[in-house]
């Protein structure tokens, strides 16, 4: 007996379709090698039609797919369009040859069925209402008109013109006639559901002489379309009910056996599995909606479905749509840490992956917020100012080319804890959660500036220092200068090898800035910060305030004005000139111009708008220079 | 929820046939992948066929030692499931159960069914 196991016996009719499973025992040898379908002839010999090796037949061409499961050690095998001709006994298997484990599987592809020659077919979702036309001569016009369903023996009364109703059809069924028109008359059966499909008879008048009609009404169940998701990503439910249901509140529920458990409504309820990462967004006046969930889990695999209902909660009967996600685990998604820790005073860095192939799409970060349908709005972004709330602690970074952004939040209080998304105006999959946890503050921070309430004085030599502890010793010190368009870094000598040092000294590892002379547009927020290659770690930042010289105050004349930034190593001085950019400010039309999936992620998008660039390490709006002291002991 | 009422057992010769029925009441019939199963004396419940459908496809699966033997079907109609057993053998004695669930990752396994007749006794004697 075959290990390989499947359905024996497969029936259809033509031009539909079938998804054949086939299970496979749990060995990793299974999981990798080869699947394969084929098709058994006269001979005994078995001709592959579609493989996972990628073999697709000529007659299966644009029909047809197959897809491993690794982690439910099964394979499917998908065929659309069939014919009486694919009528056949098949082999689903494993193995590099078709001689390997397999399974017999029949296929029986069947004409759709006759039915009378004057019934009309009514093709209808599930959900949906019909209307029935039912003609009639005029002769027939007075006498009474009915509609009944079919059974073994019988038909049953479904609702006729004396206002008798079936008890099943009560507020669904309703029989009319449109204007003058005495020929024919109507009726009108709404939330369909599957018990509703069969056959009809509609009939005016009563024996020989009364007028009859057969109808045929189909109740499909909407087909689930099939997504295929990377572990990490995310995912859009684009849910279009139709306008009929356009004022009703919408839902997203997952099947759950017997039930279909709430996800997310718009009646304000969530699963708090998907806490921080789903978003339900109404799109327009005609019932379309959408539900965007990041983040993607193994456990997030499984049967969706949409609907409208007033109670926010499935309903037989009402219009639904349907989906079956599946979650890949070989994601191209890079496993990063979905929480992340800080403290009250302190700083993160959040690493946000995206699509190594889309280096100069436009980066965003926003914070998640659970109120009504949720929403994200954007706080910071390549080409969008950093909200105000914010000013002096979030910056992002742009690292073009390595797959990486980095976005630096400081001064952190515990209103910051929450969710944050990492997103792009490129490929939506590459969408990312964080979860930022903020713990009260227990020890001294390991950054900190002196003096701490900097004021300088116009035209005079400033100089803040920035104390680290030894462990930061090995790491790259910087400072740079907060703008809303980013946070730039000041110039530095790098220092070449430090020579190695036996033991440090806590109390006097710094990095110091000098301004020199101070001008009006050093105001601001500066920052001070380590990072080791791309990598950036905590940050620290101070506010330097400029005021007016008073009378008597000493006047610092610099000698050079083209050398005013100057870095002292171990007592050494050395001189050097630095031209700094200038930062032209670029026009554009905003982050969310081109971009219609990214209004969605927050409504707030009007309010981000920017011009320059953002978080560039070379773009800096001031002409002054600095001057970094590293003092070694 | 779903009521199953299994009826069609009873006491039979080896080489003879049986049909079982199981009727479902409750919500939508053609909704629900159907099962059956048996449990022999003394031993665990095992899977013996199961069918299900999607639109106008239905798919059957069977056990080996059921295969060519046994056939399973349904009438959406009359909300019904059967499976005509031919050539009965003495090992095919037990109580046969009939399972609903409206989603089975695997259908051979009976905890992937939610909804459970009572079961009805065939005895095979030889």
């Known amino acids: 007996k075959s290990p390989i196991f499947g359905p024996q016996e497969v029936s259809s009719i033509e031009g539909d379709s079938v998804s054949i499973t086939c299970y496979y025992p749990d060995t990793s040898v299974n999981r990798h090698t080869r699947k394969y379908w084929c098709r058994q002839g006269a001979s005994g010999m078995c001709t592959t039609l579609i493989s996972s090796n990628g073999y697709l037949s000529k007659e299966y061409s644009g029909r047809a797919n197959l897809i491993n499961f690794p982690e439910n050690n099964t394979f499917v095998i998908n065929i659309e369009q069939l014919t009486q001709d694919d009528t056949g006994s098949y082999k689903c298997g494993l193995g590099t040859s078709n001689r390997g484990l397999s399974f017999d599987v029949s296929l029986e592809v069947s004409q759709v069925p006759e039915l009378p020659s004057d019934t009309h077919v009514y093709t209808k979702d599930i959900g949906r209402n019909v209307t029935i036309e039912c003609p009639f001569k005029r002769e027939n016009a007075p006498s009474k008109k009915s509609l009944c369903k079919k059974t073994n023996q019988s038909c049953e009364l479904v609702i006729d013109s004396t206002e008798k109703v079936n008890p099943s059809y009560i507020g669904r069924a309703k029989l009319f006639m449109k204007g003058t028109d005495l020929t024919v008359f109507y009726v009108n059966i709404s939330h369909l559901t599957h018990n509703d499909a069969g056959l009809y008879i509609c009939q005016a008048g009563e024996g020989p002489s009364a007028d009859k009609k057969n109808v045929d009404l189909q109740v499909l169940a909407p087909e689930p379309e099939l997504l295929y998701k990377d572990l990490r990503s995310s995912v859009t439910f684009e849910c279009d009910l139709g306008r009929e249901v356009a004022n009703e509140a919408k839902y997203l529920c997952r099947m759950n056996k017997e039930t279909c458990d709430v996800i997310i409504n718009t009646l304000g309820k969530r699963d708090p599995d998907f806490e921080g990462r789903i978003l339900i967004t109404p799109k327009d006046d005609n019932g379309r909606f959408s539900v965007l969930i990041t983040g993607l889990r193994k456990e997030d695999a499984g049967h969706y479905q949409c609907g409208a209902h007033s109670s926010g909660l499935p309903q037989e009967g009402w219009p639904i749509q349907t989906w079956q996600l599946f979650v890949n685990e070989e994601s191209t998604i890079p496993n990063r840490r979905s929480v992340v820790k800080g403290v009250t005073g302190g700083s993160v860095a959040i690493a946000c992956p995206y699509n190594p192939k889309e280096s100069s799409s436009l980066k965003y970060w926003c914070r998640w917020e659970g109120d009504g349908n949720g929403h994200c709005p954007v706080l910071v972004g390549t080409q969008a100012q950093v909200q105000e709330e914010y000013e002096g602690r979030l910056a992002l970074f742009d690292q073009p080319g390595n797959g990486t952004y980095t976005v630096i939040l400081n001064q952190l209080t515990t209103e910051d804890a929450g969710f944050y998304w990492c997103l792009t105006n490129g490929d939506s999959r590459w969408r990312t959660t964080i979860e930022l946890q903020v713990a009260e503050a227990t020890r001294e921070p390991n950054l900190e500036v002196t003096p701490q309430n900097a004021t300088a004085v116009l035209g005079e030599t400033f100089t803040v220092s920035c104390h680290y502890p030894c462990k930061f010793y090995s790491q790259e010190k910087y400072w740079c200068k907060w703008s809303n368009k980013g946070c730039h870094i000041l110039p530095s000598h790098d220092e070449g090898a430090r020579q190695s040092s036996v033991s440090c000294d806590q109390s006097s590892q710094l990095v110091s800035m000098t301004l020199n002379p101070v001008s009006k547009e050093d105001e601001g927020w500066y920052w001070c910060g380590v990072k080791q290659g791309q990598t950036y770690g905590e940050t620290t930042a101070i506010y330097i305030a400029v005021e007016e010289r008073t009378r008597g105050s000493s006047h610092v004349n610099p000698t050079d004005a083209n050398a005013r930034a100057k870095v002292a190593l171990e007592e050494e001085v050395v001189d050097s000139s630095i031209s700094e950019k200038e930062n032209k400010a670029i026009p554009n039309p905003g982050p969310f111009a081109n971009e219609r999936e990214i209004q969605n992620v927050g409504d707030q998008a009007q309010e981000n708008r920017a011009s320059g660039d953002a978080g560039s390490a070379d773009g800096q709006s001031r002409s002054s220079s600095s001057k970094h002291h590293h003092h070694h002991h | 929820q779903v009521q199953l009422v299994e009826s069609g057992g009873g006491l039979v010769q080896a080489g003879d046939s049986l049909r079982l029925s199981c009727a479902a009441s409750?919500?939508?019939?053609?909704?629900?992948?159907m099962g059956w199963f048996r449990q022999p004396p003394g031993k665990e419940r095992e899977f013996v066929a199961t069918?299900?459908?999607?639109?106008?496809?239905?798919?059957?699966y069977y056990a080996d030692s059921v295969k060519g033997r046994f056939t399973i079907s349904r009438d959406n109609a009359k909300n019904t499931v059967y499976l005509q057993m031919n050539s009965l053998k003495p090992e095919d004695t037990a109580v046969y159960y009939c399972a609903a669930s409206t989603v089975v990752a695997d259908p051979r396994a009976p905890n992937e069914y939610d909804y459970w007749g009572q079961g009805t006794q065939v005895t095979v004697s030889s």
């Open positions: 069918i299900s459908w999607s639109g106008s496809t239905t798919y059957k």
């Open positions: 409750g919500r939508t019939f053609t909704t629900y992948v």
